[in-house]
């Protein structure tokens, strides 16, 4: 790479003569960071992105740049800044030494720092029989709306955009931010530079193998001709698109990220910036067989993040490793030995392995989806990808055990019509990120901003756990999961739903003195019971099991152990109905569920009783899962019986809206 | 707007060689390669091939192997198809067309070959 | 290479006629056809693309149908512009190839 330093010297003269005395310290009581990927071959020391504080107009974030480096040249250190931001997060890409950070850290406005690091495309005609539904034959694929009213965006390597399979359907921006290739002998073949992004754009809008046939896509060269790129040059295409968006808005946007690179802090916050402006994210969970939530972009809740599976609908292994999985990942999709385009030739196909692969099909069911309802949130998006997906076919014994709970057995499918979903009340369950083992830690789990947290359970692998609350935050209500004494750990789990117009609130019972155990009820005129949680301070609640369970005609109860706070999620929105649903064992048995019927949407899973032996409560779908301790190591057949407890709810409201449409 | 410009009427001896141009504009020629479709008098349409803007690569009908050329010159978006050996049957209008989906066409080039 | 037949290979039609021009391919070609017109000593003109999508600016009086092997265009009024000679081509496969063509003339 020919040094771009040559006018370094020009540029610090300049600002030596610049004016320069200005505070140092950063304003009180704030300590910027400075962050670096925890994977250190991927690593790009030397060049920083410096993010400002959130409200830091253009004009400062330049004056900032100019302070650090008439600061550096005053020290003697030579820097350039790259790239100023703005748009999405405001800052500034600089090249510099590393000794210079701790100055960096103390300039007015800086929220942070980090350092760039590389990212990697995530690639190594079943796929369309799998996500079409039924009454379609793949032979014959051609969806109802090709995507047309949407544009997808595609951050990747250069693409042959006059292939057959894309031609007239890609616009090749100039937008390009890559990194030199490694190596002195590396030789740049065109048809290799363009097989990542041209593979990936037949998989989204191929004529003949593509998901969404009418979509149009725009495509932004991230990745080099090696398939790498930076997490500086993705953040500046991110900015390109928020920037074109403003420009000359259309209609809704899709941006495929098909590339993942170690967790970032920055990215992740612009994949949130570009998500709240109405944008849909998709990107690959990673190659890495690894947890999904130690990569960025995936780890962004904002962003859809979608693992691969074969034909069989396992997870996909490559080579040694394979398809990311957890908590993380919002869905799985095709992608392994995938049909697109190739580059060697205008009309020529291969076969690609990867979540890359993975996330350009559900690129196109997204596109697909957004065709057919323009005005779907991305929080509405999500819902119904998760909705329509085939569940439980994926065999979990594939991911470490630590991991089965929390991987999403979900496998993306198009809608069997692309309208007519609206009546329906749809949950998705989130996990936290494990709470680490201290006597007090905690856990949270979060729903997206335009969704509601209609109910809150925990899950502790130990069995040592003290339940979990629902408590406002921010103005919004998260779900928190507590630890115990001796514990390894809990996970919050929160029941996040679509319900316009809900009005939520959340009523709590302190441990009850007599020996009934704890109840609460929504008092309110109109407010129904969505979800139960139980709390306590005592590290183990014994055994005690309350004599009834829940009076009869008083559907809107929660019941819970006398020595726990219990807490009822009550809701009122037009139409919304539930009813509580019991399914108790009397023997111990590891795991007890109970589903909610046809028509009716899970939005609460709580244990009764409360006990250590159980290790938690969790949603997966429309069942509520009820986990205890091995059956081996509980003591007697009395305290074994449990009994789980599901909230079933359906909106009348929302099934009349549907049949006006219709 | 979408424009493919060709160039004039040819009159060629029975063993000689052509070479027509079709010089485009009003889009981005990168995203499409051009198609030769050419028309003998009285007759019907017949595809000849595809050649790209991007990277040269090039795809001829078999009836064409090795006796015709596609090339393109990005830097004048132009692209030219090279017929040698020519015989009489190869009297024809020569068209060019925008892709493979060959949405918007040249006005024709009209190729006489006669001794 | 797929074989392209249209039929009727000429028609005469009066000012306000429907017309009705098919086209039959040797092999399934999906909903890959597309129909041009051409007038003497001009280029052909797309008309309708995959089947039965019409570019904007083509009138709506030419509609396209069908898939698998039989297709048709339809011309629901006819105009005075519109006598002219109308190719099918299938774009299934390389190499694409065309009908023989529907000459339409004036009664």
């Known amino acids: 790479q020919e040094d771009e330093d040559g006018d370094y010297e020009e540029l610090v003269l300049a600002l030596r003569s610049e004016e320069d005395g200005l505070a140092e310290a950063p304003e009180h009581g704030t300590t910027a960071t400075f962050h670096r990927c925890a994977k250190d071959p991927w690593r790009l020391p030397g060049t920083y992105v410096v993010v400002l504080k959130e409200e830091t107009h253009l004009s400062q974030s330049e004056r900032t740049a100019r302070r650090l480096q008439a600061q550096a040249a005053r020290r003697g250190y030579l820097t350039k800044i790259l790239h100023v931001f703005h748009g999405l997060l405001p800052g500034f890409l600089v090249k510099m030494s590393g000794d210079l950070l701790e100055l960096a850290l103390k300039l007015p406005h800086v929220d942070y720092i980090e350092e760039d690091s590389s990212v990697f495309a995530q690639s190594i005609p079943w796929n369309l029989e799998r996500i079409t539904p039924p009454r379609y034959r793949a032979d014959e694929y051609q969806p109802p709306d090709g995507g047309s009213l949407v544009e997808v965006y595609l951050l990747d390597t250069s693409i042959q955009s006059d292939h057959r399979e894309i031609e007239g359907r890609v616009m090749v921006t100039d937008f390009e931010n890559v990194p030199e290739e490694d190596g002195t002998r590396f030789h740049r073949q065109a048809s290799k530079c363009d097989s990542h992004g041209t593979h990936l754009a037949g998989v989204v809008s191929g004529r003949d193998a593509g998901v969404a046939k009418g979509a149009s896509m725009r495509s932004l060269r991230v990745l080099n001709c090696q398939g790498k790129g930076t997490v500086s040059g993705t953040l500046i295409g991110l900015e390109f698109i928020r920037k074109s968006q403003l420009v000359q808005p259309v209609g809704p946007l899709v941006v495929l990220l098909p590339l993942a690179g170690g967790y970032s802090r920055v990215l992740n916050a612009a994949c949130q910036r570009l998500a709240r402006a109405g944008v849909v994210l998709v990107t690959a969970a990673g190659n890495f067989r690894d947890d999904a939530c130690l990569y960025s972009p995936a780890s962004a809740p904002e962003v859809i993040t979608v693992g691969a599976t074969n034909a069989q609908d396992q997870p996909v292994t490559l080579g040694t490793l394979g398809t990311n999985f957890g908590r993380c990942v919002d869905l799985f999709a095709p992608g392994e030995d995938i049909i697109g385009a190739s580059s060697d030739c205008s009309t020529c196909f291969v076969s690609q392995s990867g979540t890359s692969q993975a996330a350009a099909h559900v690129a196109g069911i997204a596109a697909m989806m957004l065709s057919a309802e323009p005005e779907l949130t991305l929080a509405e998006l999500r819902q119904r990808l998760i909705h329509f997906s085939a569940k439980d076919v994926i065999n979990e014994a594939w991911f470490p055990e630590d991991q089965r709970v929390l991987t999403p057995n979900l496998v993306a499918a198009l809608p069997p019509s692309t309208h007519g979903a609206g009546w329906q009340l749809f949950c998705r369950t989130v996990w936290s990120a494990h709470s680490g083992p201290t006597r007090m830690a905690t856990a949270v789990a979060r729903c997206a901003p335009d969704e509601e947290l209609l109910s809150c359970s925990s899950f502790s692998r130990s069995g040592k756990r003290r339940g979990e609350r629902m408590e406002a935050q921010g103005g919004k209500l998260v779900c928190r999961a507590h630890n115990a004494f001796g514990g390894e750990g809990v996970y919050a789990i929160a029941r996040c739903c679509l319900l316009p117009q809900a009005n939520c609130s959340v009523h709590t019972a302190p441990p009850a003195e007599a020996s009934m155990g704890t109840r609460v009820h929504c008092h309110q005129q109109g407010h129904v019971l969505t979800g139960c949680s139980s709390h306590w301070e005592v590290e183990d609640l014994g055994t005690h099991k309350p004599p009834v369970l829940r009076p009869r005609g008083q559907p809107n109860q929660c019941v819970g152990h006398r020595e726990a706070s219990i807490h009822a999620s009550c809701c009122h929105a037009p139409g919304l109905e539930c009813k509580v649903k019991e399914h108790g064992i009397p023997a111990p048995q590891e795991q007890v569920t109970v589903a909610c019927e046809e028509g009716w949407t899970l939005t609460g899973c709580s244990a009764l009783p409360g006990t250590s032996h159980v290790l938690g409560a969790y949603a997966v779908d429309n069942t509520c899962v009820v986990r205890s301790r091995d059956v081996s190591t509980t003591g007697s057949t009395s305290e074994g019986a449990v009994t789980a407890v599901a909230i079933c709810c359906r909106s009348r409201h929302l099934a009349q809206a549907s049949q006006e449409l219709q | 707007q979408v424009q493919l410009v060709q160039s004039g009427a040819e009159v060629k001896k029975p063993g000689a060689s052509v070479k027509v141009s079709c010089k485009a504009s009003g889009y981005a020629i990168y995203n499409y390669g051009i198609s030769w479709v050419r028309q003998a008098p009285g007759q019907g349409l017949e595809w000849m091939g595809w050649?790209?803007?991007?990277?040269?690569?090039?795809n001829y009908a078999q009836k064409l192997q090795g006796r015709g050329t596609m090339t393109t010159d990005p830097s004048t978006s132009t692209a030219y198809m090279e017929l040698r050996s020519l015989r009489s049957d190869d009297t024809a209008v020569y068209y060019c067309a925008r892709g493979y989906v060959m949405d918007f066409w040249g006005q024709g080039t009209t190729v006489t070959v006669s001794s | 290479d797929i074989q392209m037949t249209q039929s009727p290979s000429s028609l005469s039609a009066s000012v306000g006629d429907r017309v009705t021009i098919t086209c039959r391919a040797s092999?399934?070609?999906?909903?890959?056809l597309d129909w041009y017109q051409q007038k003497p000593g001009k280029a052909p003109k797309l008309l309708i693309y995959a089947a039965s999508t019409r570019p904007s600016g083509v009138p709506s009086r030419f509609s396209g149908s069908g898939s698998g092997t039989d297709f048709t265009l339809t011309i629901s009024s006819l105009q005075p512009e519109d006598f002219a000679t109308y190719y099918c081509?299938?774009?299934?496969?390389?190499?694409?190839?065309f009908g023989q063509g529907t000459k339409v003339e004036i009664k």
């Open positions: 050649v790209s803007f991007y990277n040269g690569n090039t």
């Open positions: 081509q299938q774009d299934q496969d390389i190499p694409p190839t």
């Open positions: 092999q399934s070609i999906n909903n890959w």
